[in-house]
Interface confidence: medium
């Protein structure tokens, strides 16, 4: 079963990357009692959300850039 149905995780699957121009903001959720894994959730400019793989080099670069632009929390 997807992890979201076992804990209270929001990311059932993750994307390895996404084009920076499509991202409005990024949220990084640390592990906790609600979810045992780090979760990276991007809010896209079309209003949708997408989970990104925190271990992906491309995602790490996205997080760095969003932090510099003040669009990450």
């Amino acid at each position: 079963a997807p992890l979201a149905t076992e804990l209270r995780c929001q990311c059932l699957q993750t994307l390895q990357g996404i084009h920076l121009k499509n991202i409005q903001s990024v949220k990084v959720k640390s592990p906790g009692p609600h979810c045992a894994q780090t979760e990276v959730i991007a809010t896209l400019k079309n209003g949708q959300k997408a989970c990104l793989n925190p271990a992906s080099p491309m995602v790490k670069k996205i997080i760095e850039k969003m932090l510099k632009n003040g669009k990450s929390n």
Epitope: A1, P2, A4, T5, E6, L7, R8, C9, Q10, C11, L12, Q13, T14, L15, K27, K29, G32, P33, H34, I41, T43, Q48, K49, A50, C51, N73
Partner: antibody, heavy 125, light 107 residues
């Protein structure tokens, strides 16, 4: 029609026990997390407990931890709340709620989108 | 635990008014916040999910905004059926917590 129906409430003495049930219909019960939420007379909403779809993960408010146990029987489409060592402050209407997850691309969230009608629990001598 | 604080606790308004209810979290919860409406003797009803998304079947006069720690529920052009108690709820982490509620009364 998606429906939740609670039962099992009533009057119980302090220190006593009660088991609440919530019968679900109209959706695939085993796929979704469920919660219990209570409301003391004239007060606001207080989350009590939650359980994952498989029953493998459970969560409790500090106020009930060690006294209440949430469980589910997916073969019967039923959610339970076993309440032990009841106190006067546990007096409330108890609601079960479905935590309907919405799935956008690679994203899931939890909202209590369907509620039962509530079952009253009174703890008094 | 994350504390949720709503203001005001009660509010008097007239049909046709525009009202705003605020909810503040004790720490950042991103947009992991919902709004519920409850009428006396009834179960709560989901209005807004993820801070700003209207639940299916909810009239468009309801809207939500905010992110981080500060959130707002706005009702444009109040209707008689809108007089009720409103609650915010965070699901960023367990334990899940609700605001204390805002009772909207007829002036």
């Amino acid at each position: 029609e998606v429906q939740l129906l609670e039962s099992g409430g009533g009057l119980v003495q302090p220190g006593g026990s009660l088991r609440l049930s919530c019968a679900a219909s109209g959706f695939t019960f085993s796929e979704l997390s469920m919660s219990w939420v209570r409301q003391a007379p004239g007060k606001g909403l207080e989350w009590v407990s939650a359980i994952s779809g498989s029953g493998g993960s459970t969560y409790y408010a500090d106020s009930v931890k060690g006294r209440f146990t949430i469980s589910r029987d997916n073969s019967k489409n039923t959610l339970y709340l076993q309440m032990n060592s009841l106190r006067a402050e546990d007096t409330a209407v108890y609601y079960c709620a479905r935590e309907g997850g919405r799935l956008e691309p690679y994203y899931y969230y939890y909202a209590m989108d369907v509620w039962g009608q509530g079952t009253p629990v009174t703890v008094s001598s | 635990d994350i504390q949720m604080t709503q203001s005001p606790s009660s509010l008097s308004a007239s049909v046709g008014d525009r009202v705003t209810i605020t909810c503040r979290a004790s720490q950042s919860i991103s947009d992991n916040l919902h709004w519920y409406q409850q009428k006396p003797g009834k179960a709560p009803k989901l209005l807004i999910y993820d801070a700003s998304n209207l639940e299916s079947g909810v009239p468009s006069r309801f809207s939500g905004s905010g992110s981080g720690t500060d959130f707002t529920l706005t009702i444009n052009s109040l209707q008689p059926e809108d007089f009720a108690t409103y609650y915010c709820q965070q699901y960023y982490s367990t334990p899940l917590t609700f605001g204390q509620g805002t009772k909207l009364e007829i002036k």
